[in-house]
């Protein structure tokens, strides 16, 4: 079997939802010593980056300026050390937002409910679209989808304090082209009196935590590694 290097990790810096005409930045984290990284879009080569010096850098950033629907879709990356290529990374879905119009988000019975009540969000957009998306702020990877001609409903069932938070919705023209976001609707869920103080909101980790953790190996690190290797040999 053909030998390959371990697959790299692909990430979107700050967010995978990019407003049209803004810049997206994707990071491909591979290996120290990689001489070339390639970014692929929908199976075709999109861009190439050659880190300098390769032995000091474990990944690269790919910049996608002027975001539009032609650049929204599935991205992956690979890297090369010498003549040996890595496996392909997982796929990353890059979405363009702020296309066309702005939907309206409402919640029934209202934004303040008691734990155990059934809640339904309604997302309305008058322009032609059939797919709607509901996102909880800080949890933008957990996208709920619903379908409808001009309006879609998102039944939440009996809610708990974990449902507390701010919600936005989008109309979707295809999987990768979304409308402007709606104005946020803040859902406040109160628990039982004795539980309220013990039921904090679900911690919402901001999307900006999804950053590029690329590192540049310093000369000191290299010297320490070499010293350690020499010491190990002396001990043997």
């Amino acid at each position: 079997p053909k030998q390959t290097l371990p697959k790299p990790i692909i990430r979107a810096e700050s967010t995978y939802m990019v407003p049209k005409e803004k810049q997206a930045t994707l990071c491909c984290q591979g290996s120290y010593g990689a001489v070339e990284y390639q970014l692929h879009f929908e199976g075709s080569l999109f861009a190439v980056e050659r880190p300098k010096p390769p032995e000091r850098i474990n990944g690269v950033k790919f910049h996608i300026p002027d975001m539009n629907s032609r650049k929204a879709g599935r991205y992956s990356c690979i890297y090369r050390v010498g003549e040996l290529w890595s496996e392909r990374s997982d796929l990353l879905d890059l979405v363009v937002t702020e296309m066309y119009d702005t939907p309206t988000l409402s919640v029934h019975p209202g934004p303040e409910v008691t734990s155990g009540e059934k809640v339904t969000f309604y997302c309305r957009l008058d322009t032609a679209t059939s797919m709607f998306l509901l996102l909880k702020e800080g949890r933008s990877r957990d996208v709920q989808r619903s379908y409808g001609k001009v309006q879609a409903e998102f039944p939440m069932g009996p809610v708990t304090t974990a449902h507390r938070g701010s919600y936005r919705c989008f109309g979707s023209y295809n999987n990768y082209a979304w409308s402007f976001p709606s104005e946020p609707v803040k859902l406040l869920v109160t628990g039982d009196i004795e539980n309220t103080s013990l039921a904090p909101t679900d911690p919402t980790f901001p999307d900006s935590w999804d950053t590029c953790l690329l590192t540049r190996e310093t000369g000191l690190q290299k010297d320490l590694a070499l010293w350690d290797h020499t010491a190990q040999n002396l001990l043997r």
């Epitope: 879009f41 999109f46 861009a47 190439v48 980056e49 300098k52 910049h63 996608i64 650049k71």
Partner: nanobody, 126 residues
Framework: EVQLVESGGGEVQPGGSLRLSCAAS????????MGWFRQAPGKEREFVAA???????YYADSVKGRFTISRDNAKNTVYLQMSSLRAEDTAVYYC????????????????????WGQGTLVTVKP
């Protein structure tokens, strides 16, 4: 706004050489990644060569070793030196730019480019 104007096209015999130039207007040239694409009659536009803002280059397999892309930031110009030309190199050659860009990305995918020239025709025939 960036404007790109290609020149240098013409008719040449197989095995001959040509140098295409692409002059860019605007002060953003030094921060632009540049590329050359071509479109033969009845075919889709295809990637030929590209250069990053830091002079890293990438070539299509079909032109590797025969074509050279370079840039002169002082003249706001990118060049495509073409040698050992073949009949299959006959096409309209387009210059393109990605503005702005950061780092040293080399762009291969045509939709990555947001500015395009009008093209210059290269004909290779005996």
């Amino acid at each position: 706004e960036v404007q790109l104007v290609e020149s240098g096209g013409g008719e040449v015999q197989p095995g001959g050489s040509l140098r295409l130039s692409c002059a860019a207007s605007g002060r953003t040239f030094a921060s632009a990644a540049m590329g050359w694409f071509r479109q033969a009659p009845g075919k889709e536009r295809e990637f030929v060569a590209a250069i990053s803002r830091s002079d890293d280059t990438y070539y299509a397999d079909s032109v590797k070793g025969r074509f050279t892309i370079s840039r002169d930031n002082a003249k706001n110009t990118v060049y495509l030196q073409m040698s050992s030309l073949r009949a299959e190199d006959t096409a309209v050659y387009y210059c393109a730019a990605v503005v702005p860009t950061y780092g040293s990305n080399i762009y291969v995918y045509s939709a990555a480019y947001n500015y395009w020239g009008q093209g210059t025709l290269v004909t290779v025939k005996p």
